[in-house]
């Protein structure tokens, strides 16, 4: 089934105009056409979209729960964002899977020079990694603090112990 | 208790809470608590979740309001992580599951995520963690050393 026909003729709440709007907005955020956006700019991007694809701010937690794949450098591919937003509107269904496959095939065929990418984490995993990193960092800073306090205490005792020898 | 949280943390918790408060009545069900916490990067076990619910859901009606949730999160953030919890945190970055993290990966994580360490702090950390200087950190030993009283 041709993607244009599939979206235009169906009674679904998403049409060709919505996808065009997505790509027009995308161009502003990715002027060099890399197909990727920095995770740090994702919140602004989805807030800038028009309904029904828009996710208005505050949206950071919502974007985490979308569990978007990320590649090295904390970048997210435009198709993964579009799929996730489409899924939010259409829900999880066989129709959604078919639409995703069609969109992916069309996209890859239309951009045959683009290198395929290997996601290494997701927005949900990244949030968990952030929390785990903080645990390690706090534990290490506590360790540094305790060590410097021990050293200070040792120096203090040492200087006072030695003061009676003169 | 909640006054120990930063404004940014409270805003994040509010967003997570609202996201799962489907009917907008200002409460979430105790069943949804795990989902909310996972969206905030926490990975509580079922037993931990039950302990938290028992602490805050005093009337046992199966719902938690935002102030209760905030109190619970503040309590969780305030608690000093146990040796096992810190080991679990390291395990997240041990992609091969072999008990080691490369010094380079550790440096990357510590300087790019969370409450970023300074270059000086991370240099010191790696000096302590990579004892034999082979570029690999046995984090089990490192955690023991860090948490030793």
């Amino acid at each position: 089934e041709n993607f244009n026909v599939a979206t235009e003729e169906s009674s679904e709440p998403l049409g060709e105009d919505d996808f065009e709007m997505f790509y027009e907005t995308w161009e502003k955020f990715d002027p060099d056409a890399t197909q990727f956006i920095a995770y740090s700019r994702l919140s602004d991007f989805v807030d800038t979209l028009q309904e029904p694809l828009r996710i208005a701010k505050p949206n950071k937690i919502k974007l985490i729960t979308l569990d978007l794949p990320m590649v090295p450098g904390d970048k997210i591919h435009c198709l993964d964002i579009l799929f996730a937003l489409t899924k939010e509107v259409l829900g999880d269904s066989g129709e959604m899977d078919a639409l995703k496959q069609t969109m992916e095939e069309k996209f890859m065929a239309a951009n045959p020079s683009k290198v395929s990418y290997e996601p290494i984490t997701t927005t949900l995993k990244r949030k968990h990694e952030e929390v785990c990193a903080i645990k390690i960092q706090r534990a290490y800073r506590r360790h540094l603090l305790q060590r410097s306090m021990k050293q200070a205490s040792y120096m203090y005792r040492h200087s006072h112990d030695g003061s009676g020898d003169d | 208790m909640a006054d120990q949280l930063t404004e940014e943390q409270i805003a994040e918790f509010k967003e997570a809470f609202s996201l799962f408060d489907k009917d907008g009545d200002g409460t979430i069900t105790t069943k949804e608590l795990g989902t909310v916490m996972r969206s905030l990067g926490q990975n509580p076990t079922e037993a931990e979740l039950q302990d938290m619910i028992n602490e805050v859901d005093a009337d046992g009606n199966g719902t938690i309001d935002f102030p209760e949730f905030l109190t619970m999160m503040a309590r969780k953030m305030k608690d000093t992580d146990s040796e096992e919890e810190i080991r679990e945190a390291f395990r997240v970055f041990d992609k091969d599951g072999n008990g080691y993290i490369s010094a380079a990966e550790l440096r990357h994580v510590m300087t790019n995520l969370g409450e970023k360490l300074t270059d000086e702090e991370v240099d010191e950390m790696i000096r302590e963690a990579d004892i034999d200087g082979d570029g690999q950190v046995n984090y089990e030993e490192f955690v023991q050393m860090m948490t030793a009283k």
């Epitope: 996808f19 065009e20 056409a33 069309k106 996209f107 239309a110 951009n111 045959p112 020079s113 683009k114 | -």
Partner: nanobody, 124 residues
Framework: QVQLQESGGGLVQTGGSLRLSCKAS????????LAWSRQAPGKQREFVAS????????YYSGSVKGRFTVSRDNAKETVYLQMNDLKPEDSAVYYC?????????????????WGRGTQVTVSS
């Protein structure tokens, strides 16, 4: 600006072969992604094959995979479509299209440069 001119179409019997050519003129050919698309009477234009500027393998639509081969010759500024084992349902006007490889588009329909097409008729 890139101009594209298709040739090589014609009438052929079922099971026969044709080789279409698309000659480009204008900007640096080697920088362009190239695609073949076709449109049968009363139907929507459909993607056939595409080839990029990198070593990525070409893309083909399911209906032509294994029968059609797309290739390019940068020195001759030409892209080819070798069509074997032709079927009546392959009858259509075949179009060549191009875009700068550094530009991302959603679908082939968004390619900015198109030829005028060449007719392929497969008789049974």
């Amino acid at each position: 600006q890139v101009q594209l001119q298709e040739s090589g179409g014609g009438l052929v019997q079922t099971g026969g072969s044709l080789r279409l050519s698309c000659k480009a003129s204008g900007r640096a050919f080697a920088r362009y992604d190239l695609a073949w698309s076709r449109q049968a009477p009363g139907k929507q234009r459909e993607f056939v094959a595409s080839i990029g500027v990198t070593r990525n393998p070409p893309y083909y639509s399911g209906s032509v995979k294994g029968r059609f081969t797309v290739s390019r010759d940068n020195a001759k500024e030409t892209v080819y479509l070798q069509m074997n084992d032709l079927k009546p349902e392959d009858s259509a006007v075949y179009y060549c299209a191009a875009k700068d490889a550094s530009v991302t588009v959603a679908t082939i329909e968004d390619y900015p440069y198109w030829g005028r097409g060449t007719q392929v008729t497969v008789s049974s």
